[in-house]
């Protein structure tokens, strides 16, 4: 017999064909015997099965010896061995009807797990193969979990069953809840303004919530809350936020603070931290400054960064147009005795330059 | 290591008045929002008023607003309370919390100072 | 100014008990909601702010759930320390408030 796949929800066609190009008698029945619809003349009539409101038949290819038999909004239940009675010949097909759902809501935060679920009827032995929207594959039976989402998971699966060496694609809309970037560094010159901004990987229509940007200065020896804010249909409003610094949010998303002067003593890292209304667990930004100063005092020329620089980060001090360099993997350079002119101070990573800031020596007569 | 160490309870009849003291030690006290918070023998915690950083910004729960009043000496490394008009409701043990924890929470508490308000 | 109900007031349990007690806010507080813990004549401590974050030192059988209006701490398994009263506070408007309080006491 022949096996057809169908998904819950969905509508499926049973096909059942006459030798004869022509309208005759036929019937469907399911294992049962109970009929489901049949001809009886010219016209469609339907039996007293569950089915009946739900199956229907093209009646334009009677004529062609086509005696389909539609079912629509396929319930797991419909799974059966259907007959289809025609020229005193039995044709048997075995609808199976499979259903896979997630487990929770399809949004869900970074770092959560997703479970997906199939719903299959009994007797049935499928295996599930789905793909996410980043290439990464994961097989199961009757369910599928993903233990921790990654924003690259957002996006629709595509989900194959198997059974009988027949297929069924199911497709998944799933939308991760994270910030665009995990963490991301802001280099500034001392005095110079300070953007942060925390951009969204995903957009929802109405967008409500709260948040906190708690903050550790590296030379401070405990962390503090440099704001905190609400989020009511994507129009941010602040509720609390430091003296020092004198910080400014954005009104509208993305999110987004100013630092009217970037100073060594607010270099360090921070964590913003945003919790969306109804759903469980938080969204987390890393967000990091640098912050560079030049000095000369009397006949010592120093270049110092403040804040989190990995190890393999250079400074140097370089005379402009001239060669005297002086490179340090490390967070403070100087040279005494400095030749007058205009001196670089460089922060550079294998080559590309993050940071600069220039400082003019007058001679000393 | 942070303190907070409250003083300046004791009995007082109805009608009168007390200043209630929160020595702060241990971190940046001008750089935290403090609250006062009270709990009536065998009773619940009830958040009173608190203050910004410099003392710009002052909130009280009603039952207390136009009586008391807090304020603070960031010079000094204290927090202040001003009771005045007392009523036996006002019995109470008083607690000075700072204004520390992620999320608005109250992250350090003092032990208290107990008001007495009797006739 | 915005109510806070606890539920139950009190509750009676075990060593090695689940605990749940809830905390109703009379409007919409997004996540500004921490949980406390009072023991007899000591100050009270913070045990979760923001809803479900845990304060630094408190032991992860303690959890916090919960959005908006409705939320929940839950006491995995019951330990000898953990009879206490607890409160849930908002810090979403002012004036600030607390939960009546639910105390947990010995079976």
């Known amino acids: 017999k022949k096996v057809v796949l169908g998904k819950k929800g969905d509508t499926v066609e049973l096909t059942c064909n006459a030798s004869q190009k022509k309208n005759t008698q036929f019937h469907w029945k399911n294992s049962n015997q109970i009929k489901i619809l049949g001809i009886q003349g010219l016209f469609l009539t339907k039996g007293p099965s569950k089915l009946s409101d739900r199956a229907d038949s093209r009646k334009s290819l009677w004529d062609q010896g086509c005696f389909s038999m539609i079912i629509k909004n396929l319930k797991i239940e419909d799974s059966d061995t259907y007959i289809c009675e025609v020229e005193n010949k039995k044709e048997e097909v075995e609808l199976l009807v499979f259903g896979l759902t997630a487990n929770s809501d399809t949004h869900l935060l970074e770092g959560q797990s997703l479970t997906l679920t199939l719903e299959s009827p009994p007797g049935s032995s499928p295996s599930v193969k789905c793909r996410s929207p980043g290439g990464k594959n994961i097989q199961g039976g009757r369910t599928i979990s993903v233990p921790q989402l990654e924003r690259q998971d957002s996006g629709t699966w595509t989900c194959t069953v198997s059974q009988d060496q027949k297929t069924v694609e199911f497709k998944i809309d799933i939308v991760v809840l994270a910030f665009q970037k995990a963490s991301s560094t802001v280099y500034k010159k001392e005095g110079e303004q300070v953007e942060f901004s925390f951009p969204l990987a995903f957009t929802l229509e109405k967008l409500t919530g709260s948040g906190e940007l708690w903050w550790q200065a590296e030379r401070a020896s405990s962390s503090k809350s440099w704001i905190t804010f609400d989020l009511k249909n994507k129009e941010v409003s602040v509720k609390r936020v430091t003296q020092d610094p004198k910080l400014q949010m954005g009104k509208k998303l993305p999110l987004h603070l100013t630092l009217p002067q970037a100073l060594p003593q607010y270099a360090g890292s921070g964590n913003l931290t945003l919790a969306l209304e109804a759903k469980t667990g938080k969204l987390h930004q890393e967000v990091n400054l640098v912050v560079m100063r030049a000095t000369q005092f009397q006949e010592n020329l120093t270049c110092e960064v403040w804040g989190p620089t990995s190890p393999k980060l250079t400074l140097s001090l370089k005379l402009e147009n001239k060669g005297a360099t002086v490179s340090k993997q490390a967070k403070a350079v100087w040279v005494l005795n400095p030749e007058a002119g205009m001196w670089q101070c460089l922060l550079s990573d294998s080559g590309q330059v993050l940071l600069e800031s220039n400082i003019k020596v007058v001679p000393t007569w | 290591e942070v303190q907070l160490v409250e003083s300046g309870g004791g009995l007082v009849q109805p009608g009168g008045s007390l200043r209630l003291s929160c020595a702060a030690s241990g971190f940046t006290f001008s750089s935290y929002w403090m609250s006062w918070v009270r709990q009536a023998p065998g009773k619940g915690l009830e958040w009173v008023a608190n203050i910004n950083q410099d003392g710009s910004e002052k909130y009280y729960v009603d039952s207390v607003k136009g009586r008391f009043t807090i304020s603070r000496d960031n010079a000094k490394n204290s927090l202040y309370l001003q009771l005045n008009s007392l009523r036996a409701e006002d019995t109470a043990m008083y607690y000075c919390a700072r204004e520390g924890g992620q999320w608005l929470s109250l992250d350090y508490w003092g032990q208290g100072t107990l008001v007495t308000v009797s006739s | 100014d915005i109510q806070m109900t606890q539920s139950p007031s009190s509750v009676s349990a075990s060593v090695g008990d689940r605990v749940t007690i809830t905390c109703r806010a009379s409007q919409g507080i997004s996540s500004w909601l921490a949980w406390y813990q009072q023991k007899p004549g000591k100050a009270p401590k913070v045990l979760i702010y923001?809803?479900?974050s845990f304060q630094s030192g408190v032991p992860s059988r303690f959890s916090g759930s919960g959005s908006g209006t409705d939320f929940i701490l839950t006491i995995s398994s019951l330990q000898p320390e953990d009879f206490a009263t607890y409160y849930c506070?908002?810090?979403?408007?002012?004036?600030?408030?607390f939960g009546q309080g639910t105390k947990v006491e010995i079976k």
């Open positions: 923001g809803v479900s």
């Open positions: 506070q908002q810090a979403n408007s002012f004036p600030w408030t």
